[in-house]
């Protein structure tokens, strides 16, 4: 299995829709695999750091990443210090939402994309797309995307160059 998240970084305004794209390829496909999307909260305060890019903390982060390519300090930490939840699973055409997400308009569409019709405050975090197949155990079966949900009053311009926040609708 080879799982790919084509766009690993998403910033969205509260209540707006978002799709986290995930695709997979398999060497053998006798049965359809299970697609599992998991949520993990950020290891550090991603949003606060995003609004203070010149801080000493962020400079240290930059040094760390420079010395360790591919290491993401907001994503790489033990599960004991963050919240972990199953968002949704898909087997065949059946999509099942995790307990915490019951009643939300969330689904797995296309190959393995996770779609939120409407984002909520607690949705900021890291979303892991994993594909499980008993027939194909080789390769990389997991990839992740970061999602940041901002309020209308947040300094959106810093995170979304050229973004224009319209008036809040009723």
């Amino acid at each position: 299995i080879q799982v790919t998240v084509s766009d690993p970084y998403h910033v969205v305004i509260l209540f707006q829709p978002v799709t986290l794209p995930c695709t997979y390829q398999m060497t053998s496909t006798p049965t359809q695999p299970i697609v599992i999307w998991k949520y993990k909260s950020f290891c550090r305060d991603r949003i606060a750091d995003a609004f203070s890019p010149a801080s000493v903390d962020n400079q240290l982060n930059a040094q760390l990443v420079a010395g360790n390519p591919g290491y993401n300090p907001y994503v790489e930490c033990q599960d004991s210090v963050r919240t972990v939840r199953v968002v949704a699973t898909k087997q065949g055409n059946a999509v099942t939402l995790g307990d915490y997400y019951q009643g939300r308009r969330i689904t797995i569409t296309g190959n393995a994309d996770l779609t939120f019709d409407e984002t909520a405050w607690g949705d900021s975090g890291v979303y892991y797309c994993s594909v499980v197949s008993a027939q194909d155990l080789e390769g990389n079966n997991e990839a992740y995307a970061e999602l940041i949900v901002l309020g209308r009053t947040s300094g959106v311009a810093e995170l979304l160059p050229g973004f224009q926040a319209g008036p809040m609708e009723d």
Epitope: A48, D57, L60, E76
Partner: antibody
């Protein structure tokens, strides 16, 4: 500069309680997970507890589970360790430490001594 | 629980000479992200511990380049290329993959 300062240690009788504090300065405290680590006299280091940056997740060593509670007040840049039902084997220097990338402890306080004795 | 075993427990050294400390874990510390979750700390006499090496081989900020970490999976080594008098103290390895566990410590002292 970046600093952690522990306080609240002292002599306490077995079965009693004590609350340790750790005051942070020089960095964005609310962005980091924080730990307590202890060291019994003449012994090695033992990890005690961790709390996530926003206080929503906590984890404890088996030796203190159910007796110790880690908490934080980000508005005061302070970490706490509430220690109940203290035992003689809890006697140690208690350090607070900052969680850094790689799950390492990059900043340590000077430590505060807790002695549990009748 | 992951058990960490250090050797030797005591290491007499000569200034200017190299020194090496070994650390073995009861299970692999290699994460799927390609990094080893193994750190090295030095606790100088009467002081708090200080971070030397994290993620197996990355030197912490301000740590002299005479310190280096190597290894992968379950076997790790801390090397000091040329020991200086200020390097005396107790060295601890620590795994950070599943909660946190320290080795027993290696006491480094000048011969």
């Amino acid at each position: 500069q970046v600093q952690l300062v522990e306080s609240g240690g002292g002599l306490v009788k077995p079965g009693r309680s004590l609350r340790l504090s750790c005051a942070a300065s020089g960095f964005t405290f609310s962005s980091y997970a924080m730990h307590w680590v202890r060291q019994a006299p003449g012994k090695g280091l033992e990890w005690v507890a961790v709390i996530s940056y926003d206080g929503s997740n906590k984890h404890y060593a088996d030796s203190v589970k159910g007796r110790f509670t880690i908490s934080r007040d980000n508005s005061k840049n302070t970490l706490y360790l509430q220690m109940n039902s203290l035992r003689a084997e809890d006697t140690a220097v208690y350090y607070c430490a900052r969680d850094s990338p790689g799950n390492a402890f990059d900043i340590w306080g000077q430590g505060t001594m807790v002695t549990v004795s009748s | 629980d992951v058990v960490m075993t250090q050797s030797p427990l005591s290491l007499p050294v000569t200034p200017g000479e190299p020194a090496s400390i070994s650390c073995r874990s009861s299970q692999s510390l290699l994460h799927s992200n390609g990094y080893n979750y193994l750190d090295w700390y030095l606790q100088k006499p009467g002081q708090s511990p200080q971070l030397l090496i994290y993620l197996g081989s990355t030197r912490a900020s301000g740590v002299p380049d005479r310190f280096s970490g190597s290894g992968s999976g379950t076997d790790f080594t801390l090397k000091i290329s040329r020991v200086e008098a200020e390097d005396v103290g107790v060295y601890y390895c620590m795994q950070a993959l599943q909660t946190w566990t320290f080795g027993q410590g290696t006491k480094v002292e000048i011969k």
